[in-house]
């Protein structure tokens, strides 16, 4: 049994790190493999992750981690029974993929404005909470040529768009994703999209 592609891991910087790797041939990951991980820190304990299959030769493991902070470094040992297949380390703060924002809501009852709000995916005591910025993607299924990205670089998870900048009488969709500048993260996955109908009409000119 051999590792073809070594494990690579990303952390949500809250509670879960996801490691993926490929084996040299078809493998029943959960039955044949174990990924052991331990924080390099006093009084830390060794934890075991049971991987799942991810395609024929691929495996994925979801490592549970508490109170993830920048100095954390984990040792990783991939075992097949008594055989050590691979040994490595993982520093979560250097491989962060934020959680996706949630609860994206569109408020169209605000005068002349489409207001989009969403929730920060982290609790206030998490270190990413005050570091997230967002990208909001708005597009129309009725108008395939229309797709815009709005960068939200302030902390408040809201975006206001003048209704007049959107075509009247057609439906739009929006989705949002996040990243954390000071942690040099990748972008999160997109949130589920939400749909609304733009009924705004320009007032008659006098």
């Amino acid at each position: 049994m051999k590792v073809l592609q070594e494990p690579t891991c990303v952390s949500d910087y809250m509670s879960i790190s996801t490691c993926e790797w490929k084996m040299g041939g078809p493998t029943n990951c959960s039955a044949e493999l174990r990924l052991l991980y331990q924080l390099v820190f006093q009084s830390s304990e060794t934890h075991t992750c049971v991987p799942e299959n991810n395609g024929g030769v691929g495996c994925v493991c979801h490592l549970l981690m508490d109170d993830v902070v920048s100095m954390d470094n984990y040792t990783l040992d991939l075992w097949a029974g008594q055989q050590l297949l691979w040994k490595g380390s993982f520093k979560p703060s250097e491989h962060v993929k934020p959680r996706a924002p949630g609860n994206l809501t569109v408020h169209t009852n605000v005068s002349d404005t489409v207001l989009l709000t969403w929730s920060n995916p982290y609790p206030p005591d998490n270190y990413l909470y005050n570091d997230l910025t967002y990208a909001v993607n708005i597009w129309s299924e009725n108008d395939p040529a229309y797709s815009r990205i709005h960068n939200v670089t302030y902390l408040k998870p809201t975006l206001r768009i003048p209704a007049s900048t959107l075509k009247s009488g057609i439906s739009y969709r929006a989705r949002v994703r996040a990243w954390a500048q000071h942690y040099n993260t990748t972008w999160s996955e997109w949130s589920p999209s939400t749909k609304w109908y733009n009924s705004y009409r320009e007032p008659f000119e006098q």
């Epitope: 009084s43 304990e45 109170d67 100095m71």
Partner: antibody
Framework: QVQLVQSGAEVKKPGASVKVSCKAS????????MHWARQAPGQGLEWMGI????????SYAQKFQGRVTMTRDTSTSTVYMELSSLRSEDTAVYYC?????????WGKGTLVTVSS | QSVLTQPPSVSAAPGQKVTISCSGG????????VSWYQQLPGTAPKLLIY???KRPSGIPDRFSGSKSGTSATLAITGLQTGDEADYYC????????????FGTGTKLTVL
């Protein structure tokens, strides 16, 4: 909100033991390490040791090895620090503090006075 | 015995800027992150800075931290009378199994 509530002040005789408690609330108790530190009157901070509430494993400063014992009770979300063979130099305020590499939440402190 | 050295005291007038240094070595500050704590009279320490230069939520941006080599610095701008306190730096001794160590402490007086 996160709270660490420590037991009240103690007066002990030299040679005795003291057990200080720190009750945690407002968060998942087993998810965060707990440190103990002390501060003698007019002096600086001195680290004593750490306990991992998840499994109960500990690590102590060399100075306190053999004299300090840290335990936890997950049913009450409480950690304990017991210091034995007390001497006058152990008179200090004892703090519990939550965290790993730095400590964002502290108890208010417990004054332990060792006097004959 | 602390191996992180801080000046025993510093002072400045309200509105001024003050810096507090913390000097260590390659087995601690030089190979680790630094945090800073403020201890107001009769109270427990409070985290001001972690990861050398990051502020927890609720800490005003008048407080900033930096690190260079084996030394770290806490800067406080726009001094207020409420800033009068003891300040401690903290880091980790990487020559042991990552045991924390604190600085000797600095008493800040706002004149």
């Amino acid at each position: 909100q996160v709270q660490l509530v420590q037991s009240g002040a103690e007066v002990k005789k030299p040679g005795a033991s003291v057990k200080v408690s720190c009750k945690a609330s407002g968060y998942a108790f087993t998810s965060y390490y707990m440190h103990w530190a002390r501060q003698a009157p007019g002096q600086g901070l001195e680290w004593m040791g750490i306990i991992n509430p998840s499994g109960g494993s500990t690590s102590y400063a060399q100075k306190f090895q053999g004299r300090v014992t840290m335990t936890r009770d997950t049913s009450t979300s409480t950690v304990y620090m017991e210091l034995s063979s007390l001497r006058s130099e152990d008179t200090a305020v004892y703090y519990c503090a939550r965290g790993k590499w730095w400590w964002q939440y502290w108890g208010k402190g417990t004054l332990v006075t060792v006097s004959s | 015995q602390s191996v992180l050295t801080q000046p025993p005291s510093v002072s400045a007038a309200p509105g001024q800027k003050v810096t507090i240094s913390c000097s260590g070595g390659s087995s601690n500050i030089g190979n680790s992150y630094v945090s800073w704590y403020q201890q107001l009279p009769g109270t427990a320490p409070k985290l001001l800075i972690y990861d050398n230069n990051k502020r927890p939520s609720g800490i005003p941006d008048r407080f900033s931290g930096s690190k260079s080599g084996t030394s770290a610095t806490l800067a406080i701008t726009g001094l207020q009378t409420g800033d009068e306190a003891d300040y401690y730096c903290g880091t980790w001794d990487t020559s042991t199994t990552y045991h924390p160590i604190f600085g000797t402490g600095t008493k800040l007086t706002v004149l």
